[in-house]
Every structure is written in structure tokens, then in C-alpha cells.
Amino acid sequence: EEELQVIQPDKSVSVAAGESAILHCTVTSLIPVGPIQWFRGAGPARELIYNQKEGHFPRVTTVSESTKRENMDFSISISNITPADAGTYYCVKFRKGSPDTEFKSGAGTELSVRAKPSAPVVSGPAARATPQHTVSFTCESHGFSPRDITLKWFKNGNELSDFQTNVDPVGESVSYSIHSTAKVVLTREDVHSQVICEVAHVTLQGDPLRGTANLSETIRVPPTLEVTQQPVRAENQVNVTCQVRKFYPQRLQLTWLENGNVSRTETASTVTENKDGTYNWMSWLLVNVSAHRDDVKLTCQVEHDGQPAVSKSHDLKVSA
């Protein structure tokens, strides 16, 4: 006569995180008397998942009516699957005794959990950098499974090639993380630019996740200065303007010096914005020529975004 067999028909089962996993198990006989137990893993450290005889297993339900007289189906459903539930599950028949003894085990079913990666988080350098400099951006995404994942970098829709990516851990794990660093060369036109990290994974059904960084938070475009003398507005008065062009960000302080002495300090307020996102600003100084006996050196000194000041001078001729 044939001895009881424990049949686990599925070698592997893959389930999305949050869903329920059904693990199939049937026995070929009701002999011997004794419970079915489900375990995750094998050996002394195996974890009890369900015991037909006793215990409370809130996430586990039996697929068939386990108390039914003829029942030989001991398939279970585990609800709200997380990556931590991944592993090999064994359906084990025990023989009634004091204590119950293991009689026969099924071959096991490997449960793999498909978990979506978290939304990629892109972070740039701590300090701003100027055009022509290379800056690094990092992209991180966590909690995905299986390990296979694709990460791409884009700048304004153009794919970048200078990046390095690591998926951790290297060995088997319930879930994984990806970390990538991309190098980007800044240009003066990058105020409106975006760097995008795109993550594609089997759980996303062809709809990748994206993380974005605006280069406006990374770039500093230093201003160009031009000081010009305007036609005389009134007798003994000369209007001198300082054109501050193509700067970003807006934080800018301008100081006028007459022969090295501070005449006036002001902060950029009513700026005009260029198409590329940089700003222009103009400051003017009304110089009373009659107050000067000699030529005057006028200096427009600009401190932009906390950087060392840049300046432009203009010599004002005072006629005898």
C-alpha cells in the first residue's frame, strides 16, 4: 500500500507586495492522524507559518475547509505579503503523538515577492557651482524585489552616459536598494534645465518612476558688469549706470564707490528675467560734478550669492 505523499505542485510562486499568496499543498491520504504544518525555511531555525492543530495565525487562511471530513487539501493563503515573507515554504505532515512527530514534508514552494521601488530621490551638490564645472547628482530608490532593475539619467530629455550605479546588497535579500551617481557639466543656459533619474522595474509594468532635480538649485551664473556714463541730465550732474547682466540666482548686492569711498549700497529687487532664466538688473548713480575738483573714479561693486565681490570702474572727467 502506498504511503502518504505531500504534494506541493508549485516549485515557485511570485506575488506582488500587498497581495495575498496562495501556497498549494495536498496529501494523498488521511493516514496517519496528525496535523499539517507550514514552515518557512528548513532546519532547526525554520519559522512556523500555520499549524492545523493549534495556534493563531491572523494572516493565514486555509483555502479549503480544513475541518471537512474528506479534506486532503491544505493549501493556505497568506495575506498582505511583504518582501520579508520571501523564502521557501514547506507543507509538512505530522503524526499524532506526544509530541507530534514529523512524518513527511513536501518539496517546498519558493515564494518571491515583487515589490515596487520607492520613488527615486535625486539630490545635487550641497553648494552651487558655476558653468563649465562638473557636478555630481545622486539618485536613490529602495525596497524593490526582484533585484533586476534599470536606471537611466537624462538632462533635458537627453540621456547621460557618465554615471555609476550600485544595487545593494550583492547577495540574496528580501529587498534591494539602488544608488547611482551621475556627472553633469553645467552651462550658462542650465537655469531651466532638469536632471532626471528614471527607474524601470518589472513591478512597474512599463511605467518607470522618475526623480527630478532642477539645476536652478545647483547652478550659479556670475554676472557681467558694464558701467556707462549717460548724457548730463542737468547742469553739474552726471548719470552713471551699472548694467548687471545674466546672473543667477537673484541674490545680489551692489555698492557704488566714489574714489574708493562707499556712496550707496542696494539689493537687487526689480530685476528682469531673460529667456534662459538668468536675470538683468541696472543701478544708476547721480554724481554731482561740482562737488569734485578732480577726476572721479566710480566703481560698481557687486557681491553675488555670497561670492567674492566683482567690480567694474569708470573714470569720470571733471572739466576745469
Partner: antibody
Framework: RQLVESGGGLVQPGGSLRLSCTAS????????ISWVRQAPGKGLEYIGT?????ITYFASWAKGRFTGSKTSSTAYMELSSLRSEDTAVYFC????????????WGQGTLVTVSS | DIVMTQSPSSLSASVGDRVTITCQAS????????LAWYQQKPGQAPKLLIY???TLATGVPSRFSGSGSGTDFTLTISSLQPEDFATYYC???????????FGQGTKVEIK
């Protein structure tokens, strides 16, 4: 689906008897067959269960004197060293207890031990 | 071995009465629920009513119910019918395979 016992009868003290329990309408291969007896005017008494070769067991009082075997359609119980107190109706039932209770039952066969 | 004590040993009741029979085990039954109830009428084989302490067997009327866990169990007939006059046995299972013991029986007679 039923069980039919046979093999009962009159036997002398110290004698032996082989009882049969034949299934019709279902197979015994995936179930145990349990034996229960009832002395005249008394209650039910569990004797033992016949599963596969390895999984056959008897109540402590029946060990040694009673043995059993089974095919896919018939279960057997050998009674030996019979005594007058073994006089009873012997029932077979499908099942091994706990989640496999005794059901259905045969109609019973009377064993009388007397000289 | 497990010992099953049934009470009462007999009772008289009328049709429509609610009848309760108890069964006490000398130790906790296997899995706290290895307890079945059987009905036997004169000259017939026993018939399964309840198993796993509270599971109604197929084809058994819903007026029969079982309850209890561990050592104390009850069979209730909510409204006694003429065909229910019979002897009722509990069968308890201990921790070992062969440790199955019937109670001494409760005879339900017509008052």
C-alpha cells in the same frame, strides 16, 4: 458507500478468529479502518486502527492479542488467545479519529467466545 | 490513557425538550478538540453526529450541536424529536495515536 463485516462466530477460549471489513463504493487506501467492539448490553470500546503497514496501532489492552492488515478494499483483524470477555459485536469504521472521525460504520459481526 | 466521563448516564425527556449531555476528559484531548459524538440505536451501528468538538457531520440535523474545548464538552439537542431517543457516546482522543476512549454512554428515554 458502506462497510460490511464478516468472519464472526463461535470460538473456543484460547482460539483465534479473523474478521474482515469490506468497503464498497470507496477505497480504503487513503483512510484508516478502526475497530470498535460492544459487549452485550455494554458501551462502545475502541480496539485499534489499521492504516498502512507502519501505521497500525491498538489500545494498550489489545496489543499482542489483536493484529491487523489492510488492502485497498478490505481490512482484516486477527483475534487470538480469545477469552470469554472478548464476546462482543465487532464493528469496523472508516477513519482514524481527530479530523478523520469514525464514519461510516459496518453493521457489526458477533464474536462469541465460549466452550 | 485518557478517561472519558459522561453525564448523566440516562435521562428522560419529552419531544421538544432541550437536552444537554456532558463529557469530561481526564486530561486535555488532543489539539483541545479531539472529541466526537455518536448516536446509537438498539441493534444498529453507531452514527457520527459531531467531530472536532463542534463540527456537524454531513447530513446531521442542525438541532444537534457540540461545544467545549480541552477537557469539558457538551452535546446539545435543541428540540428533541421522536427519532432522537437513543444512546449517545462521546469519543475522546489523547495525545497518542491509540489513545481513543469512549464515554460510558447516555441513554435518552421518553418521559
Amino acid at each position: 458507500r458502506q462497510l460490511v463485516e464478516s468472519g464472526g462466530g463461535l470460538v473456543q477460549p484460547g482460539g483465534s478468529l479473523r474478521l474482515s471489513c469490506t468497503a464498497s463504493g470507496f477505497s480504503l487506501s487513503s483512510h484508516g479502518i478502526s475497530w470498535v467492539r460492544q459487549a452485550p448490553g455494554k458501551g462502545l470500546e475502541y480496539i485499534g486502527t489499521i492504516g498502512t503497514g507502519v501505521i497500525t496501532y491498538f489500545a494498550s489492552w489489545a496489543k499482542g492479542r489483536f493484529t491487523g492488515s489492510k488492502t485497498s478494499s478490505t481490512a482484516y483483524m486477527e483475534l487470538s488467545s480469545l477469552r470469554s470477555e472478548d464476546t462482543a459485536v465487532y464493528f469496523c469504521a472508516r477513519g482514524s479519529a481527530w479530523n478523520d472521525p469514525f464514519d461510516p460504520w459496518g453493521q457489526g459481526t458477533l464474536v462469541t467466545v465460549s466452550s | 490513557d485518557i478517561v472519558m466521563t459522561q453525564s448523566p448516564s440516562s435521562l428522560s425527556a419529552s419531544v421538544g425538550d432541550r437536552v444537554t449531555i456532558t463529557c469530561q476528559a481526564s486530561q486535555s484531548v488532543y489539539g483541545n478538540n479531539d472529541l466526537a459524538w455518536y448516536q446509537q440505536k438498539p441493534g444498529q451501528a453507531p452514527k457520527l453526529l459531531i467531530y472536532l468538538a463542534s463540527t456537524l457531520a454531513t447530513g446531521v440535523p442542525s438541532r444537534f450541536s457540540g461545544s467545549g474545548s480541552g477537557t469539558d464538552f457538551t452535546l446539545t439537542i435543541s428540540s428533541l424529536q421522536p427519532e432522537d431517543f437513543a444512546t449517545y457516546y462521546c469519543l475522546g482522543g489523547g495525545d497518542d495515536e491509540a489513545d481513543n476512549t469512549f464515554g460510558q454512554g447516555t441513554k435518552v428515554e421518553i418521559k
